[in-house]
């Protein structure tokens, strides 16, 4: 039995997969910031995790996926205000009792040092200095990502 948040995440990813190709993104769109091979958009408004997930989807992007600690640090370096939290694409899967990225993969426990509980209705946010577990209903900012690629590419759940 999937939670409403897990179902929402799956539905959005599936709807995005129906488009099998899109032109490769050569440059980051206006207001997006380039970080290596990604474009990141830091919202100014606040939303619960579900709405943030949906907002990134309408922008043909996804909530931020972080590959490793190095990428986390570089992303945090782009956050200008100390106290502000941003949702990323990681939430607690009740059915699998583990942190799960919105592309379906599980968190490698060495990647992020999460402050807070791993429990139902918990989603992950990052600040300039830390990674936090928050209630998914909390209204905070969020980060969308688009992959930069110079060629026509298939759209996969983690793209």
């Amino acid at each position: 039995q999937k939670s409403s948040i897990e179902k929402c995440s799956v539905d959005i990813q599936q709807s995005r997969n129906k488009t099998t190709e899109r032109p490769g993104l050569l440059n980051c769109p206006i207001y997006w910031q380039q970080l290596r091979e990604k474009c990141l958009l830091f919202s100014h408004t606040v939303n619960p995790w579900n709405n943030s997930l949906a907002d990134c989807s309408t922008k043909e992007s996804s909530l931020l996926l972080i590959r490793d600690k190095d990428e986390l640090i570089h992303t945090q370096n782009l956050i200008r205000d100390k106290a502000i939290l941003f949702w990323i694409g990681l939430n607690f899967s009740l059915s699998e009792k583990n942190w799960k990225w919105i592309n379906g993969s599980f968190l490698n426990s060495n990647d992020l040092e999460i402050r807070g509980d791993a429990k139902e209705n918990s989603c992950i946010s990052i600040s300039q200095t830390s990674v936090y577990s928050e209630y998914c209903s909390t209204e905070i900012r969020w980060i969308c990502q688009k992959e930069l690629t110079p060629v026509r590419n298939k759209v996969y759940p983690d793209s």
């Epitope: 830091f42 100014h44 907002d55 043909e60 205000d81």
Partner: antibody, heavy 117, light 110 residues
């Protein structure tokens, strides 16, 4: 180049509902937020509210109970309804693109709405 | 939420610099780096000039610059030109997904 065009009645009777539509050309309404802003003659700007393309909205607390916003992606349009209008709602109404939720980079030319019987 | 406070008028001669202030509170200007500025000529729609306190969109001359200290943001127009004569409005994110504008400043080029 993104262009926005407001349309709707220029005259509305007191207690009735003001209805405006903004048509966006030169780009899709998806991927951005869209706001309504108004300006009474000789006065400053007032933010009315915004709509996300996911359909959710944010509204100015002072107008919240009277505002309805919607969008029609197939027509590349978004709309504002302001109910129970009074003479104080007479203003030039602008629609604007609201990229991140705190500033407005493209504006319509504005449409004057007069509330009078 | 109250309007941000701007001086009603400002003036300067061609070539001079003029600074327009925009004062808010810790709940808007002071609390976020999300201040923007707009230029409005009579009978026209506002034009986007500055965002995120000091970022300038493409096409806006570098004579226009923005800054912030505490609860007060400022727009500086250097090398004043006749076409800079207009009304200028600041705005700020004000928490809870709201935006608030200043009352506007009429800039006169003497």
């Amino acid at each position: 180049q993104v262009q926005l065009q407001e349309s709707g009645p220029g005259l509305v009777k007191p207690s009735e509902t003001l209805s405006l539509t903004c048509t966006v050309s030169g780009g899709s309404i998806s991927s951005y937020y869209w706001s309504w802003i108004r300006q009474p003659a000789g006065k400053g700007l007032e933010w009315i509210g915004r709509i996300y393309t996911s359909g959710s909205t944010n509204k100015n607390p002072s107008l919240k109970s009277r505002i309805t916003m919607s969008e029609d992606r197939s027509k590349n349009q978004f709309s504002l309804k302001l109910s129970s209008v009074t003479a104080a709602d007479t203003a030039v109404y602008y629609c604007a693109r609201d990229p991140l939720g705190s500033f407005f980079d493209y504006w319509g030319q504005g449409t004057l709405v007069i509330v009078s019987s | 939420q109250s309007a941000l406070t701007q001086p009603p008028s400002a003036s300067g001669s061609p070539g001079q610099s003029v600074t327009i202030s925009c004062t808010g509170t810790s709940s808007d200007v002071g609390g976020y780096n999300y201040v923007s500025w707009y230029q409005q000529h009579p009978g026209k729609a506002p034009k986007f000039m500055i965002y995120e306190v000091s970022e300038r969109p493409s096409g806006v001359p570098d004579r226009f610059s923005g800054s912030k200290s505490g609860n007060t943001a400022s727009l500086t127009v250097s090398g004043l030109q006749a076409e800079d004569e207009a009304d200028y409005y600041c705005s700020s994110y004000a928490g809870s997904n709201n935006v608030v504008f200043g009352g506007g400043t009429k800039l006169t080029v003497l």
